[in-house]
Amino acid sequence: KSSNLEGRTKSVIRQTGSSAEITCDLAEGSTGYIHWYLHQEGKAPQRLLYYDSYTSSVVLESGISPGKYDTYGSTRKNLRMILRNLIENDSGVYYCATWDG
């Protein structure tokens, strides 16, 4: 089942070529696998990657560029994703999600 993640919807505006950081606040007891999705207007949401907090590893969805995203846990209750070298095509709503069992 889906778990709630304590998220505050934020708007971030950045210049082309810069980086952006997105924070995901994890609910108590969240699983060690956290997924990142991108939803762009007129498209279905697509999973970009997931983070395995047990091994500190990232698994990229097929077709996702390595080096574009960096995600890591800064605390037990907080996960951050950095988007590098931004271009207009990166615009959209980014979600984090996790599942129990």
Partner: antibody, heavy 122, light 108 residues
Framework: EVQLVQSEAEVKKPGASVKVSCKAS????????MHWVRQAPGQGLEWMGL????????VYAQKFQGRVTLTRDTSTSTDYMELSSLRSEDTAVYYC???????????????WGQGTLVTVSS | QSALTQPASVSGSPGQSITISCTGT?????????VSWYQQHPGKAPKLMIY???NRPSGVSNRFSGSKSGNTASLTISGLQAEDEADYYC????????FGTGTKLTVL
């Protein structure tokens, strides 16, 4: 001179694991990402994953998720790529390649190891 | 995201110039100036020939040059020589496939 020297060729049976090493010299090991790329016979280059300079995090291609593990030993300036549950389609030359930028990867690979041929056959 | 597309083969005579294309999208080749090119001789490891679209590493002949227009990057080899016969791969930041499909260059 910057150099990456890989371990010798290996022959493995289906279902087994293989661990390939890549020893770096001539530069500050903990300043660069390392990538692993494979090439099946007669085929193109296929990116597998990367490990960050400190060895604290890794990124894997989905295709290899759950089967590949990248590690590094900073004391010996050596990277390792372990691939488990081998099948015949894993027969390939495996390369390590240094990301030539510092910390923020900016996508160019230089130098490359000489390659390690892994043959999976029953 | 689709792969970076290269012609399967190109050929030229000694002394001629040839161009190898690498076509991507606005999310990879068109979006960044981070295209690199690699030469691979049979049985050998790839070698970096061009980085950041048009920069040549030291030790690489100035017969090799790179450029980009829109979503397509190009590698041009002038004054073709027998030792240029090899496979060539492009790579672009932003590409899910990381590497292009590869081009076999034959020197006639």
């Amino acid at each position: 001179e910057v150099q990456l020297v890989q371990s010798e060729a290996e022959v493995k049976k289906p279902g087994a694991s293989v661990k390939v090493s890549c020893k770096a010299s001539g530069y500050t090991f903990t300043r660069h990402y390392m990538h692993w790329v494979r090439q099946a016979p007669g085929q193109g280059l296929e990116w597998m994953g990367l490990i960050n300079p400190s060895g604290s995090s890794t990124v894997y291609a989905q295709k290899f998720q759950g089967r590949v593990t990248l590690t590094r030993d900073t004391s010996t300036s050596t990277d390792y790529m372990e691939l488990s549950s081998l099948r015949s389609e894993d027969t390939a030359v495996y390369y390590c390649a240094r990301d030539n930028s510092h910390l923020d990867q900016v996508w160019w690979f230089d130098p490359w190891g000489q390659g390690t041929l892994v043959t999976v056959s029953s | 995201q689709s792969a970076l597309t290269q012609p399967a083969s190109v050929s030229g005579s000694p002394g001629q110039s040839i161009t190898i294309s690498c076509t991507g999208t606005s999310s990879d080749v068109g979006g960044y100036n981070y295209v690199s090119w690699y030469q691979q001789h049979p049985g050998k490891a790839p070698k970096l020939m061009i980085y950041d679209v048009s920069n040549r590493p030291s030790g690489v002949s100035n017969r090799f040059s790179g450029s980009k227009s829109g979503n397509t990057a190009s590698l041009t080899i002038s004054g073709l020589q027998a030792e240029d016969e090899a496979d060539y791969y492009c790579s672009s930041y932003g590409s899910g496939s990381v590497f292009g499909t590869g081009t076999k260059l034959t020197v006639l």
